[in-house]
């Protein structure tokens, strides 16, 4: 699985036209430095990224494997501008556990046994009434609504 030529989550923003040396962003840097916001803050940032990145990787893996015709149709509809509303409708009716399972579903047990095993274990523990630490970690890091919004904003395929 390549990490190359895959899109990270893209956000809408206006790029600064200012010269970097007069960029207002840089004027805040002295403040940040004086407050000592260095690697300890970066560690927290990385903690928050980890769960998101894993889901992004799963989605890119699904895309690159291109092993489900249904998913291909969804990509096409994304290009036509209808995918976002479809995802919204679908996710509104799904529990977080089912959504994670949906991401992994169909990837093939032989290719990705670890992720499939994780989801199956989550399902078993959920059925037992003992919700998993793993799921709690994910849900703690990503509130369901924020997660849905993040997914919708994610550029799922790079259509260059």
């Amino acid at each position: 699985r390549s990490l190359q030529d895959t899109e990270e989550k893209s956000r809408s923003f206006s790029a600064s036209q200012a010269d970097p040396l007069s960029d207002p962003d840089q004027m805040n840097e002295d403040k940040r430095h004086s407050q000592g916001t260095f690697t300890s803050d970066y560690s927290k940032y990385l903690d928050s990224r980890r769960a998101q990145d894993f889901v992004q990787w799963l989605m890119n893996t699904k895309r690159n494997r291109n092993n489900i015709a249904k998913r291909h149709d969804e990509f096409e509809r994304h290009a036509e501008g209808t995918f976002t509303s479809d995802v919204s409708s679908y996710l509104e009716g799904q529990a977080a556990k089912e959504f994670i399972a949906w991401l992994v579903k169909g990837r093939g047990r032989r290719d990705f046994p670890e992720e499939v095993a994780i989801v199956e274990e989550l399902g078993r523990r959920h059925a037992d009434g003992s919700f998993s630490d793993e799921m709690n970690t994910i849900l703690d890091n990503l509130a369901a609504r924020d997660f849905i919004n993040w997914l919708i904003q994610t550029k799922i395929t790079d259509r260059k």
Epitope: E8, D25, Y42, L46, D53, I118, E134
Partner: antibody, heavy 119, light 112 residues
Framework: QVQLVESGGGVVQPGRSLRLSCAAS????????MHWVRQAPVKGLEWVAF????????YYADSLKGRFTISRDNSKNTLYLQMNSLTAEDTAVYYC????????????WGQGTLVTVSS | DIVMTQSPDSLAVSLGERATINCKSS????????????LAWYQQKPRQPPKLLIY???IRESGVPDRFSGSGSGTDFTLTISSLQAEDVAVYYC????????FGQGTKLEIK
């Protein structure tokens, strides 16, 4: 294909400043976080700084003591590193590196630009 | 910061033979929520930048020959080249990306 080209290195006296640039092409620059990593003969590979795709997050190595500033211009597909109050310990090859979809993992590196701090 | 320590510092192996490089982290880089080890391996040839070989301890990056493999979990990791080729002469670095990124000191691989 992805290309990262650094420039701006050279010989500079202690206490002076230098600005490095990294011109990116072959990928959607505004969608990826970017890093500076340096390599000195004595200290090996050392992470320097990170900036997120939308500039909302910037982080630095503690060892820099606030002397360096990372920035980017997404309209120009260019990453920058402003280096102030340089010392001999800053002598190194400076690489810009593209972050993969996994945070703090570098899937593409530039060829590097040599910064030599010497009187 | 997490300290990465590689061994050996240098290694000489005959062409066609197996080369093994070890990497130890000062604390675990295993993320329990997805059972992934946030450990990468890079290859750096003379006068070139590092090149990503392996991430998540064992996943080969696209285009990397299958003679390269990674293994290990928690704090102990290994990069193995099953059959050394002349073009594999380089310095190899491990890097953890679980926290603020840090690199091992490098292992220089040469032909015996």
């Amino acid at each position: 294909q992805v290309q990262l080209v650094e420039s701006g290195g050279g010989v500079v006296q202690p206490g002076r400043s230098l600005r490095l640039s990294c011109a990116a092409s072959g990928f959607t620059f505004s969608s990826y976080g970017m890093h500076w990593v340096r390599q000195a003969p004595v200290k090996g590979l050392e992470w320097v700084a990170f900036i997120s795709n939308d500039k909302s997050n910037k982080y630095y190595a503690d060892s820099l003591k606030g002397r360096f500033t990372i920035s980017r211009d997404n309209s120009k597909n260019t990453l920058y590193l402003q280096m102030n109050s340089l010392t001999a310990e800053d002598t190194a090859v400076y690489y810009c590196a593209k972050e993969s979809i996994l945070a703090a993992l570098f899937d593409y590196w530039g060829q590097g630009t040599l910064v030599t701090v010497s009187s | 910061d997490i300290v990465m320590t590689q061994s050996p510092d240098s290694l000489a192996v005959s062409l066609g033979e197996r080369a093994t490089i070890n990497c130890k982290s000062s604390q675990s880089v295993l993320y329990s929520s997805n059972n992934k080890n946030y450990l990468a391996w890079y290859q750096q040839k003379p006068r070139q930048p590092p090149k990503l070989l392996i991430y998540w301890a064992s996943i080969r990056e696209s285009g990397v020959p299958d003679r390269f493999s990674g293994s290990g979990s928690g704090t102990d990791f290994t990069l193995t080249i099953s059959s050394l080729q002349a073009e594999d002469v380089a310095v190899y670095y491990c890097q953890q990306f679980y926290s603020v990124p840090t690199f091992g000191q490098g292992t220089k691989l040469e032909i015996k």
